[in-house]
Amino acid sequence: QGWQAFKNDATEIIPELGEYPEPPPELENNKTMNRAENGGRPPHHPFETKDVSEYSCRELHFTRYVTDGQCRSAKPVTELVCSGQCGPARLLPNAIGRGKWWRPSGPDFRCIPDRYRAQRVQLLCPGGAAPRARKVRLVASCKCKRLTRFHNQSELKDFGPEAARPQKGRKPRPRARGAKANQAELENAY
């Protein structure tokens, strides 16, 4: 089927702290060192980013007509295209989750479709042909999913909510940012 763009806008997916992924157990080594468990204070400058939206996994809303040969839908349909970053390597305070953040390289995420919806459309055809109904599958939401050593890019691993662990050890340094700093930024993807 062909698509004709009509208009688009964007929604950003910026997960809350509880949604920060814990890399699957089989991908982490057995050392107990990690930032949330060991209660380090949130760092300031180096881990902050000025524009959170610059790195978010975006849901771009496209309004399109469905076409099939010479036939075209009577009304446009709106669907999402997943785009942008799942989060930068530059992390926000308190947004580290249980990842081994001090490593120079880490888990890779992708912004891809999460849920789909089916929509019935009516196709109008030229030359007086009878309209026909057709069901199309449209992207309903986007999500960051991890590439793992056991998955290729077409089999991406989901991450789900994770309860933030109570912190122990050092007391956090006062945060320089506002509420937006609570929003977790995930690993970088493209």
Epitope: A89, R103, H151
Partner: antibody, heavy 119, light 111 residues
Framework: EVQLVESGGGLVQPGRSLRLSCAAS????????LHWVRQAPGKGLEWVSG????????DYADSVKGRFTISRDNAKNSLYLQMNSLRVEDTALYYC????????????WGQGTTVTVSS | QSVLTQPPSASGTPGQRVTISCSGS????????VNWYQQLPGTAPKLLIY???QRPSGVPDRFSGSKSGTSASLAISGLQSEDEADYYC????????????FGGGTKLTVL
Amino acid sequence: EVQLVESGGGLVQPGRSLRLSCAASGFTFDDYALHWVRQAPGKGLEWVSGIGWEDDMIDYADSVKGRFTISRDNAKNSLYLQMNSLRVEDTALYYCAGNSRGYGGLDVWGQGTTVTVSS
Amino acid sequence: QSVLTQPPSASGTPGQRVTISCSGSSSNIGGNTVNWYQQLPGTAPKLLIYSNNQRPSGVPDRFSGSKSGTSASLAISGLQSEDEADYYCAAWDDSLEGSYVFGGGTKLTVL
């Protein structure tokens, strides 16, 4: 200016020990993860070890595990590498490097200190 | 032998576009982000690309990174004489207890 300066290299016999130091300036030291990377003469880069801001946030390359110990002293803005049971194959230029972003590569490097292990 | 495989050499003329490949496996490039470093003769390495395709401030946009499956690439467009250097890819490797692995390096010659 962000700066890392390594010291402590030299000529040492196989089986002996050496301690490398890295002095940092120009940035908030304990916000950085720090690493040692070495480069044998005419060869490529080899990561040796890395540390977060606490002593339980540590990784080692298999080739040095059990022989080398990485540590840091945030009060002194210093990183250390204690190298024991040195081998001829440990001969290299040792760089101190840091990353200011989680999973964001080593974005600060020193100029290196040379370790030569030879009898 | 390096865990990540790079061609030992590459070359191009000024203004040309050159691509350097880096091949790994599912335990490194396949699941983790890739970084690229430039090492000019007689100097310390410099971070060129982090997290597959992100440029640190100060790195010209002539340099770009990409990743697909278990391979990554560094592209340099509008090649300049000062780009003559060794280039290294690197990624975390999840096998065993894990380590940060580098490619063997690619010597880029500007003809």
